[in-house]
Interface confidence: low
């Protein structure tokens, strides 16, 4: 949006579409440029030229807050925004008023204005910014602190969310979120946000407000989890009847209405969007909740948030499935409806949630709630392996350092001179409709960073704690994933985005990949064991993990994913005429299985799966695992090979072409 005077006057522009939607906890760069035809304005021969004055402000609800003012190379920042807003290119480029904002909070939504004054000239441009997403706390159905790191991530996924990052929890805390329950975050740390420190909730910060941390924890330890729900394209709605519904009846009613029971993540997003209902209803995980947006004493104790009905006064357990409540349904553009059996029928393994947003008050509850919600929950100090205040210090607040990236820094795909082997057919056979020149395999070496207990060791692969790190690229093209898309891509493939430590361990074990990829801490890196021209990066001719530092989340790269262990088996499927992608899906389903994800194939490879035949995977890619390299089978290195459509290692094969399949059950 730009507002300017006629052609010969000062003009300001923000070349971004409005509204600009950004994720909670992310950083945001808003470009703002001005053209000043007057250039130095001199008021009189004896006075110095006037410099342009830059002012950034945020306008919300008729109120304007000045974020910063800059002139003559000096920047003055509003004390409330110190360390949050900067002008990264000023004064190096005097006409560049680009603003960078760290750790976006929901409260940062609004209209941002870039205004430039020069003498009597004045011009401005505005941009609406919408911060998306909400952080919420999850608890398993049975009792508190029962989720290991893997189950914590799955708990979030099963409730239309992903595990939150430290930045997202920090942003939520700054927005007012507090919860005295330790929960996993995406970087494998355990934290909880406290505004009013009290007995049992001091953590590592004593009597100071802030996000408490236990540091990085072993993945087998159990806590609750903090999840992040980004947005939903559909709609949450209530259904009721004179008798209300049992859990099963509620599920049926939603189905009758062309919908299904909503997840907790969906209800949180609806609440964030203003949903208010003083009546408790069933959700997909068998929890009973209700969203309160307008505080009133007889409805959630004058508190806002998504309220939860518990079976026990200590905020554990869910109501009996035969008790009666409304149904909270969801209809919208999901990728796939959750099958009826998804959440099971109860018991210890059911992953579910505790979501009292502001505890500490005895709550009058709606109809059919007998136990009441308990008063403020506390951190239990009896965990066997550490005290409430462990020695691990909390890292400094997140900051962004963007190093200069030379044009040559981005690694290019190496020229593959060797002829691509063709493991997409049985030996000495060609695949109908697919000739040798049309498909190319990648020589990705994938290093195993763990081995499941009792699994066969992959020859030549080191045994390290952890799992398997692998490079992932969507079929379409190279460097196409934003930071958020990268995280989602790993999750979709049955893995999580790798941490710098995991990539470093993989590099030390011999992993090499000349492709820049996102990591968990929003840095972009790639591991090079044998430096060569297009893969020099920031390390000249020394081996090592190259890094571009922390990158803006809107930039696009590939991603490095990490898969830990396989809970099930990957098996190779074939038949004489082989399968189209669709037929492969159908065949796996007929075997009570699904097409394996890329992550599952990597995990199976790490446990010894070796197949010289490429097979369909769930994302439409074609890959094959090589444990024992042989000349006719993927070159001289172990790893998971990918068959690409184009020689530059991009493009998925035609889904109607015929290949084998890898199934998972």
């Amino acid at each position: 949006v730009e507002v300017s005077e006629p052609d010969n006057s000062l003009s300001v522009s923000i070349p971004e579409p409005s509204p600009l939607r950004v994720l909670l906890g992310s950083s945001l760069t808003i470009p703002c440029y001005f053209i000043d035809p007057m250039h130095p304005v001199t008021t009189a021969p004896s006075t110095a030229p006037l410099a342009p004055r830059i002012k950034w402000s945020r306008i919300s609800k008729e109120k304007e807050v000045v974020l910063l003012v800059a002139t003559e190379g000096r920047v003055r920042v509003n004390s409330a925004y110190q360390d949050k807003v900067t002008l990264p290119n000023y004064p190096a480029i005097p006409s560049d008023a680009t603003l960078e904002i760290q750790n976006m909070r929901s409260n940062d939504s609004g209209i941002l204005r870039c205004e430039v004054m020069h003498g009597i000239e004045d011009s401005q441009a505005t941009l609406e910014v919408v911060v998306k997403g909400i952080v919420f706390h999850y608890r398993a159905i049975s009792t508190r602190y029962t989720l290991d790191f893997d189950r914590a991530q799955r708990a979030c996924l099963q409730n239309s969310a992903i595990i939150a990052t430290p930045e997202q929890l920090q942003a939520a805390y700054e927005d007012g979120f507090h919860q005295c329950d330790a929960g996993w975050l995406a970087d494998q740390t355990v934290r909880y946000p406290i505004h009013t420190p009290r007995e049992g909730c001091y953590g590592d910060k004593d009597e100071f407000p802030g996000v408490r941390t236990y540091g990085i924890r072993d993945t087998n330890e159990t806590y609750d989890v903090y999840c992040f729900a980004e947005e939903m394209e559909g709609e949450v709605f209530y259904a009721t009847s004179p008798e209300k519904f049992t859990f099963q009846e509620a599920a049926n009613e939603c189905r009758r209405l062309g919908a299904r029971l909503a997840t907790t993540g969906q209800l949180y997003l609806a609440w964030q969007g203003g949903m208010d209902m003083c009546s408790a209803g069933w959700l997909a995980d068998r929890s009973v909740r209700y969203p309160i947006s307008k505080a009133r004493p007889n409805c959630g104790g004058n508190l806002l948030g998504v309220r939860t009905v518990y079976l026990h006064a200590n905020q554990t357990g869910y109501p009996d499935p035969s008790s009666r409540y409304d149904a909270i349904c969801y209809t919208g553009e999901d990728f796939v409806d959750i099958p009826e059996s998804f959440f099971g029928v109860g018991g210890e393994e059911d992953i579910t949630i505790q979501t009292v947003t502001w505890p500490d008050v005895e709550l009058p509850l709606p109809r059919n709630i007998t136990e009441g919600e308990a008063r403020g929950s506390v951190i239990l100090t009896a965990k066997p392996d550490f005290e409430v205040s462990p020695t691990a210090p909390e890292p400094e607040e997140p900051f962004t350092f963007v190093p200069e990236v030379r044009a040559t820094a981005f690694p290019e795909v190496e020229n593959r001179t060797e002829e691509a082997t063709r493991p997409w057919a049985f030996p000495r056979e060609s695949t109908p409709g697919l000739g040798a020149p049309t498909a190319f395999t990648s020589e990705d070496l994938v290093v195993q960073v763990t081995l499941a207990p009792g699994a066969a060791e992959v020859p030549g692969q080191p045994r390290l704690p952890g799992g398997v790190v692998f490079h992932y690229r969507p079929g379409s093209s190279r460097y196409s994933l934003t930071f958020e898309e990268a995280k989602q891509a790993c999750l979709r493939t049955g893995a999580i985005i790798a941490s710098p430590e995991q990539l470093q361990a993989a590099y030390e074990a011999g992993y090499e990949q000349c492709d820049a990829g996102w990591l968990q801490d929003q840095t972009v890196r790639y591991p090079i064991v044998s430096p060569r021209t297009p893969c020099v990066g920031d390390k000249d001719s020394s081996p090592g993990v190259r890094t571009y530092g922390v990158r803006p989340p809107s930039e696009t790269y590939d991603v490095y994913c990490y898969v830990d262990r396989l809970e099930g088996e990957v098996f190779f499927a074939t038949r004489l005429e082989q399968f189209t992608f669709w037929e492969a899906q159908e065949f796996c389903e007929s075997q009570n299985a699904t097409l394996a994800t890329t992550g599952q194939l990597y995990a199976a490879w790490s446990r010894g799966l070796d197949k010289c035949y490429a097979g369909w995977l769930a994302d439409g890619s074609l890959r094959y695992p090589i444990v024992t390299p042989r000349p006719a089978c993927g070159g001289d290195k172990p790893g998971v090979r990918t068959v690409y459509l184009y020689p530059n290692q991009t493009g998925l094969l035609d889904p109607l072409s015929r290949h084998h399949a890898f199934c998972f059950r």
């Epitope: 062309g258 299904r260 919208g332 553009e333 990728f335 796939v336 669709w582 899906q585």
Partner: nanobody
């Protein structure tokens, strides 16, 4: 697998309406996402609309949003495409498809069963 038969195509003037039907035979119609695609002469098959197996979720291509409506009657094993404010550029063979996947940007490979198509011609 389900077998699909489209009907309801024909010649219509610009601005007019048509309602396409797709009758499915076979088991468990209600467990399939149903989609409509179209193919104009010399062009690739393009996505028009999809409806989830429950019927509660729909997606439309930008080119037909606000003009076309997809619906289904699981009791009758039928999916419909109501086409209003038709334009000459809507001229194509319209195909009905059934699949077990549902996503916001459907692709032909998601669908395992296809009808033989019905011709829609919009004259100016």
């Amino acid at each position: 697998e389900v077998q699909l038969v489209e009907s309801g195509g024909g010649l219509v003037q610009a601005g007019g309406s048509l309602r396409l039907s797709c009758a499915a035979s076979g088991r468990s119609f209600s467990s399939y996402a149903m989609g409509w695609f179209r193919q104009a002469p010399g062009k690739e098959r393009e996505f028009v609309s999809i409806i989830s197996w429950s019927g509660g979720s729909t997606v439309y291509a930008d080119s037909v949003k606000g003009r076309f409506t997809i619906s289904r009657d699981n009791a009758k094993n039928t999916v419909y495409l109501q086409m209003n404010s038709l334009k000459p550029e809507d001229t194509a063979i319209y195909y009905c498809a059934a699949g077990r996947l549902y996503r916001a940007t459907p692709r032909p490979a998601d669908f395992g069963s296809w009808g033989q198509g019905t011709q829609v011609t919009v004259s100016s």
